[in-house]
Structures are given as C-alpha cells and as structure tokens.
Interface confidence: low
C-alpha cells in the first residue's frame, strides 16, 4: 500500500497529508488484487496534480472515487475508460480549471461533485451547467467559474453565445423487418458548436456500415439476423455541451426453431423440456404417437421463462404411467414458417414386466425456471385422447 495510504481488500484510503502522495495510488504487484478495489478515497494530497490515462485502469471494479482538498489539475481524457462500474466521483476543492465531458460520457454516474474548483468560464464547462440543470435534486452544487475579468461567477448564470446542446432526429421510430432483409436508417443532427454524429448500434450482430457527413448520416444494415430482434439503434449528436440521441427499436420477424427438446425428467412433475425461438410468438402443438395431444389439467404446456423471442418450457405430466410412454412431437409455427421435433418418452414399465423406470431415462432433475407464463398454443381438438394420469396425491388432494 502506498505511503500515506491505507489499503484493505476493497478500499484504498489516502488522507494523511504527510508525507502525502504525488501520483495516483498504485498497488504493488503481489498485494491486493486491484480488480477488487471498489472505493478510493484521497484527501489533502496537495502534490497530486494529475490522473494519467493508465492510473485508474487496473481498478475495474471501482465504484466510488473521491479526491478532495488536493491539488488535482488535470485528468486525462481516457482515464476512466476501463472503469465502467464508477458511480460516484467527488473532486471537491481541487485545482481543476477545466474538465471535459469525454471523461465521463461512457459512465453511468449517479454523482459527480465538483464544488470548489477554479473553473475557467468557457464553452468547455457548459456541460457541467447543463448537467446541473438536468438534475431534479434540490441539493444542486454551488459551482463557480472565473470570467475574463477574473471575477467568480455562478455557473448557473453562465451565458456563452453559440454554446448549446445539439439535437438528433431519426426518421423511423419503430422498425420491424423480416430476417435476412436489409434496411437503411437516416439521421440528421444540428447544433452550435456543430456536433459530431455517430451511430450507437450496441452489440448488433448483423452486418452494418454507415455513411456520415457533419449533419446527415445513414446506417445500412444487411442480411438482418434474428439475434438482433429487440436491440436498440441510436443516432447520437455530440458536442462540448452535451449530447442528444434519437433511438429506434429493431424488431425482427422470423420462423420458429425448436432449439431444444429432451427426454422427460422428473421433479415434482414429469417434464418434457423444450426451448423454442420465433417472432411473432409461435403457436405450439403437441402430438402423441402421431395424433394431436389434447391438453388437460394433468397434461399441459407450461412456459417457465420468456426471453424476448425465446421460450423455455415443459410439457408437464402429473403422475404419468406406462400408458403415457410413447413418441411426443412438438410443432411450433408462426406466419414465417414452422419447425418440429420428436422424442421418445418412457415413464414406467408395464406392470409385472418392468418395475423401475427405464435406465435410459434417468431421473435428472430439470431446473424449473420458477415463473409460470401463459401457455401458448391452441388445443381445441379433443379426439385421440391419451390415457389420463393419476389425479390425486396421497392426501387425496387434486393436483
């Protein structure tokens, strides 16, 4: 642990001014793992003037950074690039004359305290005023800056010509497209200072390319993948003062696929587990030995987890007997197509022939996802019913 600091497994604390620190604290290679540090508190360190680009990067788990009553004058633009967990930054009473939005724009900060710094009045710090105004909290900070006459003026009163927030405008508010197709999005931006424009496509899987001039831009997405359904695409306008974005949600329609269908497992019920993907939501239909399976309260489809366009569930059977052994087929369909898969189920041997469960179907407990969703599928045809399963438990209560 650096001199003048205290270190624990999760905190670094440097508050005693003598002898003090001249550089941002770094841990010795064989000491505490810097990834586990969640809080760094620095106070009264008048000789600490700079946070360099690589000073903080090792502390990837850092949530709270406090540097108060110290000599901080300069923070490198990419200083916090690797610190995506940062939530609270307190730079009270330092020597900062300017501070850029770029330090913090990728962070989801819930607190940025900058009181008591000798900021210079310019468009460079207008973003701080904008940030203050956007806060609904009543305890806004008393921030000041020095104007050309070296007068301290409240940041709240700062007026700088041609220094305002930009705007972004995206043509399509909702976007639904079929898998495999291509689309082009257009966006226009405006503002003074003239903003930069960029596209934020997150983790878009589909191939995309953009053409951007200063105030106009287009994004072409080709051969759209079903994996991109539900993703958000944003057009961002950014200048010194701040940013504006206009976003569109991408909905991709695609034919169903049954990605998982397994032999039955026994928990409190027997379950034939499945996973189906599709958008719009596929209708599900079960067949038993080639005939439509009419569901009842004893044999029914349960969806446990819905993950956007993916459905995890079970064909649930209460106390099945040898009469329920056989082939089970799941069909999933929507307007873009259908998919089917089949498994063989063996619940119990025939009486007198095979007393135990077939060893080919061991009792592996299927993880119940815990939240029952509405069943999907239509089961109106009541012909070819398969034998009902036992409907009471040992207490005589119905299941």
């Amino acid at each position: 642990c650096p001199t003048s600091c205290k270190c624990s497994a999760s905190r670094i604390w440097c508050s005693d001014p003598s002898p003090g620190i001249v550089a941002f604290p770094r841990l010795e290679p064989n000491s505490v793992d810097p990834e586990n540090i969640t809080e760094i508190f620095i106070a009264n360190q008048k000789r600490l003037e700079i946070i360099n680009e690589d000073d903080v990067e090792a502390y990837v788990g850092l949530r709270n950074l406090t540097i108060v009553d110290s000599g901080l004058k300069f923070v490198a633009h990419k200083a916090f690039l690797k610190n995506s967990n940062l939530q609270h930054i307190n730079f009270t009473r330092n020597k900062l004359t300017s501070l850029s939005r770029k330090h913090f724009r990728h962070l989801d900060l819930s607190e940025l305290i900058l009181v008591g710094n000798p900021f210079t009045c310019s468009c460079d710090i207008m973003w701080i005023k904008t940030l203050q105004e956007a806060k609904s909290s009543p305890d806004t900070q008393d921030l000041y800056c020095l104007n050309e006459s070296s007068k301290n003026i409240p940041l709240a009163n700062l007026q700088i010509p041609n220094c305002g927030l930009p705007s972004a405008n995206l043509a399509a508010p909702n976007l639904t497209v079929e898998e495999g197709k291509s689309i082009t999005l257009s966006c226009s931006v405006a503002g003074d200072p003239v903003p930069n424009m960029y596209w934020d496509v997150g983790n878009l899987v589909s191939k995309h390319m953009n053409e951007t001039s200063h105030t106009q831009g287009s994004l072409r997405i080709t051969n759209i993948s079903s994996d991109d359904s539900g993703k958000q695409i944003s057009c961002v306008a950014e200048n010194l003062v701040g940013e504006d974005q206009d976003s569109v949600n991408l909905t991709v329609h695609f034919a169903p696929t049954i990605t998982f269908l397994e032999s039955p497992t026994s928990d409190h019920h027997w379950c034939i587990p499945f996973t189906v993907k599709g958008n719009p939501k596929p209708a599900l239909q079960w067949f038993y030995n080639g005939a439509i399976l009419n569901e009842s309260k004893y044999i029914c489809t349960k969806i446990h987890v819905t993950n956007h366009t993916e459905y995890h569930g079970c064909l649930q059977l209460d106390n099945p007997t040898h009469m329920n052994n056989g082939d089970y087929t799941l069909i999933a369909k929507n307007e873009y197509g259908k998919d089917e898969k089949q498994i063989s189920a063996h619940f119990m041997g025939w009486p007198g022939i095979d007393d135990g469960a077939n060893p080919n179907y061991p009792d592996v407990i299927y993880e119940d996802y815990g939240t029952a969703a509405n069943d999907i599928g239509d089961t109106t045809n009541r012909s070819n019913e398969i034998p009902s399963t036992d409907v009471t438990d040992k207490t005589g209560r119905e299941h």
Epitope: D16, P17, S18, P19, K46, G71
Partner: antibody
C-alpha cells in the same frame, strides 16, 4: 536533518500585536501542511489552524477563527502565527508542527501581561 | 471542548498493561488514521504512533495502537516508570477540514 525552528519567547502587553515564526528545513516546505498548536499552562494541546505553504490554503479551528492569522512565505520556508491585539488569555506555549507530526518546533512561549 | 474524547487520567503499576482510549466520530477516527503523541513536562510533544498502529523508529514495541469504528486505543504493556507522561490522540477531521486533538490523558505509574 528535517526540523522546524521557532522564533524565541515573547513578553507582550495586552492590545499589542505579535507575529511569531517557524522555519522549516531539510524537506520540501511547500509540500506539507504546517499547523500551529496552543498549549495553555497546565492544559492540553489545541489545534489552532493549518496552512499548506504550496498554495496558502489555510484552515482554522472554529475557536481560533478570527482570533489569529496564519500565513507562510514559501520563498524562505517560513510559517507565521499572528495576533493583531493580544489578550492576557493568549499566554501559552505555541508549537508549530508538520501534519503527520513527525516534525515539531521547539515551542515559543508567549506571555501577555500588563 | 476537544473533538476527540480521552479519559483525563490513567494509572498502572510497573509491568502492568494500560490502555488509553480515544473516541471520535465518522468524520475523524471513522475515516482517518490516528496519531498518538507523548509529552513530558516542559518539552514538545513527540510522535509515538502514526497511521493508527505504526511505531516510528525508536519507539519500543511495548506501545501498540488499534482502532475499531470511531474509537482508537493506545496500549502500553510492561509499564515502566519512564512512561509517566501525557498522551494525546489526533486525527484529521473532514468536518473541520483539519486536524483535531483529544484532551489528553495523564498517565501515572504507581
């Protein structure tokens, strides 16, 4: 050798002004806080205030705010404690010390008596 | 009224272990390290313990420091007659933006 050397004992009358000094040597004077501590006869140590000579950032203990002035001249590595109008109750031993407290001055005895 | 609270006096016989407490708040001891000073009559205080439990060179290991929450303690084991002195705790205080002292504890070796 790191040391703080204070000016000599003073005998003053009530209402007079006084400025006592504390000269640092053997270390970077501008980079460490220097504080002034009062010890009245038979009493404990009391922090009066502290100054950072590098930028003259000065903080006073609430009970001494407005009663004394702490200053520093970094060009000669010296900190000062000053009264504009002394009172009999200012009679005490005054120590300067660098925070971290590994360095203390030898003390300056101030006696205020009519 | 000192910001940090110490008992005004403590005593012990030679060879005994004596503990002096120092109680503060979250703005001082709760968040900062504690220093302890020893002062003999007519002399300037001397640093006895820094960073709560670190001894400067020359201070015997009979002296030890500890902290729990907003309280700190100085323990002297194997008490000797030359330990008879005044002991003060101090810490930086965030509310006052400077250091604060305890009122001091007069240790008597019986």
């Amino acid at each position: 050798e790191v040391q703080l050397v204070q000016s000599g004992a003073e005998v003053k009358k009530p209402g007079e002004s006084l400025k006592i000094s504390c000269k640092g040597s053997g270390y970077s004077f501008t980079s460490y806080w220097i504080g002034w501590v009062r010890q009245m006869p038979g009493k404990g140590l009391e922090w009066m205030g502290i100054i950072y000579p590098g930028d003259s950032d000065t903080r006073y203990s609430p009970s001494f705010q407005g009663q004394v002035t702490i200053s520093a001249d970094k060009s000669i590595s010296t900190a000062y404690l000053q009264w504009s109008s002394l009172k009999a109750s200012d009679t005490a031993m005054y120590y300067c010390a660098s925070w971290g407290m590994d360095v203390w001055g030898q003390g300056t005895l101030v006696t205020v008596s009519s | 009224q000192p910001v940090l609270t110490q008992p005004p006096s403590a005593s012990g016989t030679p060879g005994q272990r004596v503990t002096i407490s120092c109680s503060g708040s979250s703005s001082n001891i709760g968040t900062h390290t504690v220093n302890w000073y020893q002062q003999f009559p007519g002399t300037a205080p001397k640093l006895l313990m820094y960073s709560t439990f670190q001894r400067p060179s020359g201070v015997p290991d009979r002296f030890s420091g500890s902290k729990s929450g907003t309280s700190a303690s100085l323990a002297i084991s194997g008490l000797q007659s030359e330990d008879e002195a005044d002991y003060y705790c101090a810490a930086w205080d965030d509310s006052l933006n400077g250091p604060v002292f305890g009122g001091g504890t007069q240790l008597t070796v019986l």
